[in-house]
């Protein structure tokens, strides 16, 4: 359990930038939590570098990360989930850089899944539904979701809708007729826990109906 590297320690290493970022995932594997860290500079030579977390742990002082290619990873039940932990980059017993981080403020939810879109002919709308594993979790239950959709031909013209439920209605008249749309969704913690957006769900593709010339309404698919 060593502290910050002193000036003059590891002279060669001092030239490098060891800044890193981490995210936590709670109850990601049953009751196990995970913590993932990576260097911000992809060119850092990680050969002899290790990560260690100390403090805010249950009945242990410190835990060592496993190295998985360019990322460092812990899966454990031993997070207290309150207060700050000291996360350090180490070479042997020497700490090169350390950060104090509250793991409840760097939570990255799991990506939503089972995204689908159903057209309701009578209502002239599309019902978007998706699922999230967080509905079953003890901790990170309350999420804000970001549904993004675009016409497939519009490379970067995404429309975003934020919602707290897992169901969204898109009005047909707000969409272009006879067009192919791509839609996807991601999540972020929204109560007590703080952190980052999840990865995006796999995209779902749907086509809007043609306009029915006599009524001015779209034809169903």
């Amino acid at each position: 359990e060593s502290g910050y590297a002193q000036n003059g320690d590891l002279e060669d290493a001092e030239l490098d930038d060891y800044s890193f970022s981490c995210y936590s995932q709670l109850e990601v594997n049953g009751s196990q939590h995970s913590l993932t860290c990576a260097f911000e500079d992809p060119d850092v030579n990680i050969t002899n570098l290790e990560f260690e977390i100390c403090g805010a742990l249950v009945e242990v002082k410190c835990l060592n990360f496993r190295k998985l290619q360019e990322i460092y990873f812990i899966e454990t039940k031993k997070f207290l989930l309150i207060g700050k932990s000291n996360i350090c980059v180490k070479v042997g017993e020497k700490s090169l850089t350390c950060k104090k981080i509250d793991l409840t403020t760097i939570v990255k939810p799991e990506a939503p899944f089972d995204l689908s879109v159903v057209y309701r002919e009578g209502a002239n709308d599309f019902v978007v539904t998706f699922n999230t594993s967080h509905l079953q979790k003890k901790y990170v239950k309350v999420l804000m979701h970001d549904v993004a959709y675009r016409q497939e031909k519009d490379e970067n013209k995404w429309t975003h809708v934020n919602l707290s439920s897992t169901k969204l209605t898109l009005l047909q008249r707000k969409l272009q007729p006879a067009a192919m749309y791509e839609i996807k969704v991601r999540s972020i913690p929204d109560h007590y826990f703080k952190g980052f957006w999840s990865e995006w769900s796999p995209s779902y593709y749907f086509r809007t109906p043609e306009i029915n010339n006599s009524s001015g309404e779209m034809d169903p698919i």
């Epitope: 359990e1 060593s2 403090g55 742990l57 249950v58 207290l80 989930l81 207060g83 700050k84 000291n86």
Partner: antibody, heavy 119, light 105 residues
Framework: QVQLVQSGAEVKKPGASVKVSCKAS????????MNWVRQAPGQGLEWMGL????????SYNQKFKGRVTLTRDTSISTAYMELSRLRSDDTAVYYC????????????WGQGTTVTVSS | EIVLTQSPATLSLSPGERATLSCSAS?????MHWYQQKPGQAPRPLIY???KLASGIPARFSGSGSGTDFTLTISSLEPEDFAVYYC????????FGGGTKVEIK
């Protein structure tokens, strides 16, 4: 102001159990750990364990594991320490102490509860 | 488990004198805290994270050190400073030292 108020003195027989309460006020109870520290007569301080009031997760000193149980009732901002199979050397003052999770020191202490174990 | 050894066990000094209290760890510690305890009272925090003054603590108290050796210094003893002082490591199992009693000479 931030305050921890503990239950009154107890006299117990060897082999019995004791449950000490610690009522918190003046802060968000679930935002800080609650630690328990004891002090035998004329002796130093000994950390027994802590509880995270938000989720009930506990961390115990191995010396007391199996004999001490920490619980909490968030609805009344109260933490509890129960020590079982009491022995005469458990005679001590028992303190609850709020844990500052940024720096992991005990920033606010209760007034202490004297537990006497005697046959 | 880390053992914290405080020395001296007793320090006999007069008001106005400088007090230097030592806390030695059996292996390296990242942060150390210090508490003051008077007879019949609960401990109160003095210094946290080696050198940061706890709320309401006068500037005559200071902390220093790293690795295995830490020091609490009281630059000029006031009558209310005569008490027992404990060091404590920041991490599980939050071990306390045995204490140093600062008494009036």
């Amino acid at each position: 102001q931030v305050q921890l108020v503990q239950s009154g003195a107890e006299v117990k027989k060897p082999g019995a159990s004791v449950k000490v309460s610690c009522k918190a006020s003046g802060y968000t109870f679930t935002g800080y750990t609650m630690n328990w520290v004891r002090q035998a007569p004329g002796q130093g301080l000994e950390w027994m364990g802590l509880i995270n009031p938000y989720n009930g997760v506990t961390s115990y000193n191995q010396k007391f594991k199996g004999r001490v149980t920490l619980t909490r009732d968030t609805s009344i901002s109260t933490a509890y320490m129960e020590l079982s199979r009491l022995r005469s050397d458990d005679t001590a003052v028992y303190y609850c102490a709020r844990g500052d999770g940024n720096y992991w020191y005990h920033d606010v202490w209760g007034q202490g509860t004297t537990v006497t174990v005697s046959s | 488990e880390i053992v914290l050894t405080q020395s001296p066990a007793t320090l006999s000094l007069s008001p106005g004198e400088r007090a230097t209290l030592s806390c030695s760890a059996s292996s390296s510690v990242t942060y150390m805290h210090w508490y003051q305890q008077k007879p019949g009272q609960a401990p109160r925090p003095l210094i946290y994270e080696i050198s940061k003054l706890a709320s309401g603590i006068p500037a005559r108290f200071s902390g220093s050190g790293s690795g295995t050796d830490f020091t609490l210094t009281i630059s000029s003893l006031e009558p209310e400073d005569f008490a027992v002082y404990y060091c404590q490591e920041w991490n599980y199992p939050y071990t306390f030292g045995g204490g140093t009693k600062v008494e009036i000479k």
